[in-house]
């Protein structure tokens, strides 16, 4: 649709994956489209097939190598093209000069675990996954705790303005079931955004000892 609105958004996970979403008003669901990636200073190029995720939206992942390999740097520019089949030919629909380290979205943190739990406190740790060594310590985290009777959207956000892969939750209620999530974001990049939330970690605080105020 020439006068319709389209959107082509891609993010680099800082290692070996570029995830892209292409949407276009009025586009047909069965349209066959691809994303082509052409780096300006690499010998490789890569293609992925856009698969429908909603009525007028398609997504795919450009797998650039082994998950922990450092395939791009801050000086790389990758020309990304959306090509859609029109009859017998492929038509270029969109082009973006993609600066990987300006468009970062890391993988969700993994390996969440309860390090220590008490009646009112819980210490939780996690790990970051497939994050570039270029960041060194220049990462921040957001965490949230789901309390009984509330939704995730209602949970207050706890901000960790440094690379700290643990948190001590306090003022919890004894003998209560909670869930915990965390996400990560590099400080670098004009269009950088938060990672997806981690898988929730369920934990229960210890019951208060009878006759004692803990």
């Amino acid at each position: 649709a020439v006068n319709g609105t389209s959107q082509f958004t891609c993010f680099y996970n800082s290692r070996a994956n570029i995830s892209c979403v292409w949407s276009q008003d009025g586009a047909l669901q069965d349209t066959s489209c691809q994303v082509h990636a052409w780096p300006d200073r690499r010998r490789w190029n890569q293609t992925c097939e856009l698969l429908p995720v909603s009525q007028a939206s398609w997504a795919c992942n450009l797998i650039l190598g082994a998950p922990d390999s450092q395939k791009l740097t801050t000086v790389d520019i990758v020309t990304l093209r959306v090509l859609c089949r029109e009859g017998v030919r492929w038509r270029v629909m969109a082009i973006q000069d993609f600066k990987p380290f300006e468009n970062l979205r890391l993988m969700a943190p993994i390996s969440l675990q309860v390090v220590h739990v008490e009646t009112h406190r819980c210490n939780i740790s996690w790990e970051i996954s497939q994050a570039s060594h270029y960041f060194e310590r220049h990462l921040e985290f957001e965490a949230r705790t789901l309390s009984p009777g509330h939704t995730w959207e209602e949970a207050p956000l706890l901000t960790l303005k440094q690379k700290q892969e643990w948190i001590c939750l306090e003022t919890l209620t004894p003998d209560t079931q909670y869930e915990f999530q965390v996400r990560v974001k590099p400080l670098q990049g004009e269009f950088t955004t938060w990672s997806p939330w981690s898988q929730p970690l369920a934990f229960r605080t210890k019951p208060a000892a009878l006759g004692k105020d803990t």
């Epitope: 389209s6 300006d40 969109a94």
Partner: nanobody, 123 residues
Framework: QVQLVESGGGLVQAGGSLTLSCAAS????????VGWFRQAPGKEREFVAA????????LYADSVEGRFTISRDNAKNTVYLLMSSLKPEDTALYFC????????????????WGQGTQVTVSS
């Protein structure tokens, strides 16, 4: 904010050539890809060509492919549209527009617009 000013329009005979310029000023303009659109009297605005700043990748409308060439001069913050083998149906008001990240053929994908420059092709 980005400001765009087109120039170079005029009256030309069919088969002739003309070069339009789009000069830009404002915040980090070299990050914004640029497109040319045109609007003939009584018709809708239509896509002509577009270019990305960094790689110089280009996109053309089928009606002008092979006749028009879009280029850019990063040092001058200027985008050019070289129009050759002009036809009377190329007569229109030509606009340049800047997109935030991506060039497409859709005018709604462009955020900043110039005022336009008139091109008239006589037969």
């Amino acid at each position: 904010q980005v400001q765009l000013v087109e120039s170079g329009g005029g009256l030309v005979q069919a088969g002739g050539s003309l070069t339009l310029s789009c000069a830009a000023s404002g915040r980090a303009f070299s990050n914004y890809p640029v497109g040319w659109f045109r609007q003939a009297p009584g018709k809708e605005r239509e896509f002509v060509a577009a270019i990305t700043w960094l790689s110089g990748s280009t996109l053309y409308a089928d009606s002008v492919e092979g006749r028009f060439t879009i280029s850019r001069d990063n040092a001058k913050n200027t985008v050019y549209l070289l129009m050759s083998s002009l036809k009377p149906e190329d007569t229109a008001l030509y606009f340049c527009a800047a997109a935030l990240k991506t060039i497409t053929r859709g005018q709604n994908d462009y955020s900043y617009w110039g005022q336009g420059t008139q091109v008239t092709v006589s037969s």
